[in-house]
Interface confidence: low
């Protein structure tokens, strides 16, 4: 239904707290360099304006669209051109072009310092002094670094953060209470960020149809007892929610997500028997819980998939009459039978099925042509299964850090032109798949591994798009979203690459490395490893292991030395010489 004032409608639906949080996220995601105080001032102005519209929907400007209201606010910021360069040109455009322009200027890798967590005592002091401002800072800092973060989920993580601080700041040992809990939230939020970015990429590059196909597969796996009409309704609603969030319409997105959660909880009987625990929770927790609810028990009496999609005499007729619906039912039926497959794999199978029907239904004897289609799925299924087995075996043998290093070597050989920080970030993230997925039961490994890898590789593609340097990466990133992971896996050593010359300063270290946290130490070592591979792309695993072991030994020795500086300055050059010799 149409509302006289869109902003009043959203304020009423969401309530002041969520309204303000979402407006702050929106501004922080659009203008990523502005300080918290600048954004907080704008948020207050928008909120005050919303309240005047709630009181009188006919008041001046209350009938304007949210894009117009928010865009006007952003464009009124002083020194916009000095701080944001050509983004200021967006302000010369009219809606909807202006919002599109803002979206195009979102930076997936803003040059902002890493979000450092203050020490426990300081954090608790500022949280107790003003919890609202403290949480505002959290929303602002995360949103500006992750301009596509799923806004209602970010409110959920802020709520988690709040609960942890409330609990831990009352404890004697605040540090040991806060650290593991906040680390847990951070890890989950980072995964949520790359997953959502993947959804927005799917929407931006391939449109709503591609996203809806993803949603149908995912929902069918989770709710195998729901019928196709129910799955289609949920997929349509979920597509709308994600389209809004990816498009910067955060108030509408959060509102529609709450509506979808309400619908699911009111229609459990036709969706799933596993929803009640989620439905008992308050809004943010409820929606989060529903998004990762366990799979319902599969119906026991499902007929073989071949009956309707291979053996039926009407296959080509059904396909011709309504292609999207027929392919949708295939995807639904296949997915509900296979919670053990990744969504990417299911979409590849549906694509293969579609291509087979396109070819066969034009032939003289279609059933003879498409009769073997299910057998032809076998290699498509085996490939990711082998990937999971090989990588999980390697993870179990090497542990997370060693596994990350193996991936770093592999990917540096595949795309040595890519910047070292990007390769290290990608390898560290890809390497976490072991800890995240390889410890799961067998039937959950494949969906976990492949869908996580796909999301990480999407980030690699986004960063590469900004400065394309590798033909290998461009090739894999140009294809369809579901083919990316197999494409990257199939890449081998880039034979066109001219090795980097050996620079001693790249491998020169100082005593400051000794005081770094373990994670930062690892990144330094991994940076050196990537540089070694760039120098010698065809170095054997054995050669690289020798050099890295020597390097680790050198660090250990010098960091324990009484005179660290002298140790680094005398032993460092010896290490460099040994490295060169080992790789010669």
């Amino acid at each position: 239904e149409a509302h006289k004032s869109e902003i009043a409608h959203r304020y009423n639906d969401l309530g002041e707290q969520h309204f303000k949080g979402l407006v702050l996220i929106a501004f922080s995601q659009y203008l990523q360099k502005c300080s918290y105080d600048e954004h907080a001032k704008l948020v207050q102005e928008v909120t005050d304006f919303a309240k005047t519209c709630v009181a009188d929907e006919s008041a001046a400007n209350c009938d304007k669209s949210l894009h117009t209201l928010f865009g006007d606010k952003l464009c009124a910021i002083p020194n916009l051109r000095e701080n944001y360069g050509e983004l200021a040109d967006c302000c010369t455009k009219q809606e909807p072009e202006r919002n599109e322009c803002f979206l195009q200027h979102k930076d997936d890798n803003p040059s902002l310092p890493p979000f450092e967590r203050p020490e426990a005592e300081a954090m608790c002091t500022s949280f107790k002094e003003n919890p609202t401002t403290f949480m505002g800072h959290y929303l602002h800092e995360v949103a500006r670094r992750h301009p596509y973060f799923y806004a209602p989920e970010l409110l959920y993580y802020a709520e988690q953060y709040n609960e942890i601080l409330t609990q831990c700041c009352a404890e004697a040992d605040k540090e040991s209470c806060l650290t593991p809990k906040l680390d847990g939230v951070k890890e989950k939020a980072l995964v949520s960020s790359v997953r959502q970015r993947m959804k927005c990429s799917s929407m931006q590059k391939f449109g709503e149809r591609a996203f809806k196909a993803w949603a149908v597969a995912r929902l069918s796996q989770t709710f195998p007892n729901a019928d196709f009409a129910e799955i289609t309704k949920l997929a349509t609603d979920l597509t709308k929610v994600n389209k809004e969030c990816c498009h910067g319409d955060l108030l509408e997105c959060a509102d529609d997500r709450a509506e979808l959660a309400k619908y699911m909880c009111e229609n459990q009987a036709t969706i799933s028997s596993k929803l009640q625990t989620c439905c008992d929770k308050p809004l943010l927790k409820k929606a989060h819980c529903l998004s990762e609810v366990e799979h319902d028990t599969m119906p026991a009496d499902l007929p073989a998939i071949a009956a309707d999609f291979v053996e039926d005499q009407e296959v080509c007729k059904n396909y011709a009459e309504a292609k999207d619906v027929f392919l949708g039912t295939f995807l639904y039926e296949y997915s509900r039978r296979h919670p053990d497959y990744s969504v990417s794999l299911l979409l590849r199978l549906a694509k293969k099925y579609e291509a087979t029907l396109e070819k066969c239904c034009a032939e003289a004897n279609p059933p003879a042509c498409y009769g073997t289609v299910l057998a032809e799925f076998q290699p498509l299924v085996e490939e990711p299964k082998n990937l999971v087995k090989t990588n999980c075996d390697l993870y179990e043998k090497l542990g997370e850090y060693g596994f990350q290093n193996a991936i770093l070597v592999r990917y540096t050989q595949k795309a040595p032109q890519v910047s070292t920080p990007t390769l290290v970030e990608a390898a560290r993230n890809l390497g976490r798949v072991g800890t995240k997925c390889c410890t799961l039961p067998e039937d959950q490994r494949l969906p976990c591994v492949e869908d996580y890898l796909s999301a990480i590789l999407n980030r690699v593609c986004l960063l590469h798009e900004k400065t394309p340097v590798s033909e290998h990466v461009t090739k894999c990133c140009s294809g369809s979203l579901v083919e990316r992971r197999p494409c990257f896996s199939a890449l081998t050593v880039d034979e066109t690459y001219v090795p980097k010359e050996f620079k001693a300063e790249t491998f020169t270290f100082h005593s400051d490395i000794c005081t770094l946290p373990e994670k930062e130490k690892q990144i330094k070592k991994q940076t050196a490893l990537a540089e070694l591979v760039k120098h010698k792309p065809k170095a054997t695993a054995e050669q690289l292991k020798t050099v890295m072991d020597d390097f680790a030994q050198f660090l250990d020795t010098c960091c324990k030395a009484a005179d660290k500086d002298t140790c680094f300055s005398t032993e460092g050059p010896n290490l460099v010489t040994r490295c060169k010799d080992a790789l010669a």
Partner: nanobody, 115 residues
Framework: EVQLVESGGGLVQPGGSLRLSCAAS????????MSWVRQAPGKGPEWVSA????????RYAESIKGRFTISRDNAKKTLYLQMNSLKPEDTAVYYC????????GSQGTQVTVSS
């Protein structure tokens, strides 16, 4: 199609008893928690009581605790509400719902407590 049909309501004097039934069809009744909800004239829906899918875990609103008992028979796909020591303020239309929701997907049964 999911259907819930309530019965057993009526006019009763204060202190009296009634037993409401809710016959379910169109879904796997034994897999879902169920609730009773009521709506008094001119008021919003009020959650009354809930029971889990197996019938072991029951919950009650403060206003009816000790007077009402919720139960179910999964073989018969039926939910029950035994109402004792009824009071005039229990007058309302009673609905059964799937899960612990206050949304009404059925016609309900009228309970009137009056002398």
């Amino acid at each position: 199609e999911v259907q819930l049909v309530e019965s057993g309501g009526g006019l009763v004097q204060p202190g009296g008893s009634l037993r409401l039934s809710c016959a379910a069809s169109g879904f796997t009744f034994g897999s879902f928690g169920m609730s009773w909800v009521r709506q008094a004239p001119g008021k919003g829906p009020e959650w009354v009581s809930a029971i889990d899918s197996g019938g072991t875990d029951t919950r009650y609103a403060e206003s009816i605790k000790g007077r009402f008992t919720i139960s179910r028979d999964n073989a018969k796909k039926t939910l029950y509400l035994q109402m004792n020591s009824l009071k005039p303020e229990d007058t309302a239309v009673y609905y059964c719902t799937i899960g612990q929701s206050t949304s009404r997907g059925s016609q309900g049964t009228q309970v009137t407590v009056s002398s």
